[in-house]
């Protein structure tokens, strides 16, 4: 099943997020991803946990998953590089870099997103954009077109309250509010974009979605700048 969803979102403007990727397993959407360089897509490590025997591909330039679009193209994956410290049973270091079989053909609907290199927390209250093709309601309806939601960043102290994530949010993670509107499993690997810059990647740990006491958890890309650079080099 797809890992992740956007709850309470709206349909995104078509091709207005040219960095958006759909990580696919055997031709079906599995996770979100974000184009960070011509030949590299960043996603979440847990996305490939159950993909050992399947064919992993990356769809770029898409708004609709099913309809033909001139900008859409499916790329094979040459190499999958999960973060060396990622583990199945934790949300820490939940990053994955996918090297495409060739450089992506760039254009208005396909373009890498600048990612944050300055290792400083995003100010609480900042509105950030999350997009994905995950299911849109608790009944499990899957959208065909890209959805997005605006979420305010939540300070780490609040997110770490006993009633919330009880100390699990390290300095390498960040949270966003989850009151009715939320990212969740199926949007895992997708981008959290603040001020036009990639700040976070949706983690793929299992948690209840759309519950304000369980804020969304995102991996802070700035905290992994050295690792990303070393893989892309």
């Amino acid at each position: 099943p797809p890992r992740g969803r956007i709850l309470g979102g709206r349909e995104a403007e078509a091709h207005a997020r040219p960095y958006m990727a759909s990580v696919q397993l055997n031709g079906a959407h599995l996770c979100g991803g974000v184009l960070v360089a011509e030949q590299w897509v960043l996603s979440a490590a847990h996305c490939l946990e159950d993909a050992a025997d399947g064919k992993v591909q990356v769809l770029l330039g898409a708004h609709s998953l099913s309809q033909p679009e001139p900008s859409k193209r499916l790329y094979d994956v040459l190499r999958a590089v999960p973060h060396p410290d990622s583990q199945p049973d934790t949300i820490d270091h939940d990053l994955l870099l996918l090297q495409l079989s060739e450089k992506a053909t760039l254009g208005p609907a396909v373009r890498p997103l600048p990612w944050q290199r300055v290792d400083r927390d995003v100010a609480p209250g900042t509105l950030c954009d999350v997009a994905g093709w995950g299911i849109v309601n608790h009944a499990g309806r899957r959208p065909d077109s890209l959805q997005h939601v605006l979420l305010p960043v939540l300070d780490r102290a609040t997110c770490n309250r006993r009633t919330h994530h009880d100390g699990a949010i390290t300095e390498r993670l960040m949270c966003a509010e989850s009151n009715r509107r939320d990212s969740c499993k199926g949007d895992s690997g997708g981008p959290l974009v603040c001020g036009g810059v990639l700040e976070g990647v949706v983690t793929s740990g299992s948690r209840v979605c759309g519950n304000r006491k369980k804020p969304g958890i995102y991996t802070r890309v700035a905290s992994y700048a050295a690792w990303i650079d070393s893989v892309l080099a």
Partner: antibody, heavy 120, light 107 residues
Framework: EVKLVESEGGLVQPGSSMKLSCTAS????????MAWVRQVPEKGLEWVGN????????YYLDSLKSRFIISRDSAKNILYLQMSSLKSEDTATYFC?????????????WGQGTSVTVSS | DIQMTQSPASLSASVGETVTITCRAS??????LAWYQQKQGKSPQLIVY???TLAEGVPSRFSGSGSGTQFSLKINSLQPEDFGSYYC?????????FGGGTKLEIK
């Protein structure tokens, strides 16, 4: 029908405190960010602060952070603004406002406003 | 903090005319811009948010445009009820700041 009704303001001495309230009706209060905005007579609008859905996070104009506290009571559908160490420059009409459902810091419904005068 | 600069500060126009008010942000606010109308002694009313989305009940003679740092509000065929003050505001993040306002008066 969405309604926001502020409590009576009034005249207070410099250095004193005052608590404003705003009673909300016609919508699910706990589903919305709420804000306070003020307006000096014949002048522009100034955002005072916001509170999130359940009151766990508040955001303030930097210059007011140490003196103003925003809170909410979701059981009673009431938003509060506690002002302390009041100064003459806090004299203004204070509005409570509801954050738009999706674009939280746009304000789609406003109260009628309540006048606060700080003077000796 | 992001500064919002509105122009003109005041404007005289006749019923039936078309007017445009502009707003400039000191940094890129993408599409996160709102416009409010305020009549004397009343509370502000949201007219437009996210640059061009009309708020509920707002007539179609109002339209918003722009992106990044430059925005405008256009009112076609001015009606008597359109006169008053207009404020732009970014709703991009904390603190959401307002422009200084434009007073639209009847000529």
């Amino acid at each position: 029908e969405v309604k926001l009704v502020e409590s009576e303001g009034g005249l207070v001495q410099p250095g004193s405190s005052m608590k404003l309230s705003c009673t909300a009706s016609g919508f699910t209060f706990s589903d919305y960010y709420m804000a306070w905005v003020r307006q000096v007579p014949e002048k522009g609008l100034e955002w005072v602060g916001n509170i999130n859905y359940d009151g766990s996070s508040t955001y303030y104009l930097d210059s007011l952070k140490s003196r103003f506290i925003i809170s909410r009571d979701s059981a009673k559908n009431i938003l509060y603004l506690q002002m302390s160490s009041l100064k003459s420059e806090d004299t203004a009409t204070y509005f409570c406002a509801r954050g738009e459902d999706f674009y939280l810091y746009a304000m789609d419904y406003w109260g009628q406003g309540t006048s606060v005068t700080v003077s000796s | 903090d992001i500064q919002m600069t509105q122009s003109p500060a005041s404007l005289s126009a006749s019923v039936g005319e078309t007017v445009t008010i502009t707003c400039r942000a000191s940094e890129n606010i993408h599409s996160y811009l709102a416009w409010y109308q305020q009549k004397q002694g009343k509370s502000p009313q949201l007219i437009v948010y996210n640059t061009k989305t009309l708020a509920e009940g707002v007539p179609s003679r109002f339209s918003g445009s722009g992106s990044g740092t430059q925005f405008s509000l256009k009112i076609n065929s001015l009606q008597p009820e359109d006169f008053g003050s207009y404020y732009c505001q970014h709703h991009y993040g904390i603190p959401p700041t307002f422009g200084g306002g434009t007073k639209l008066e009847i000529k």
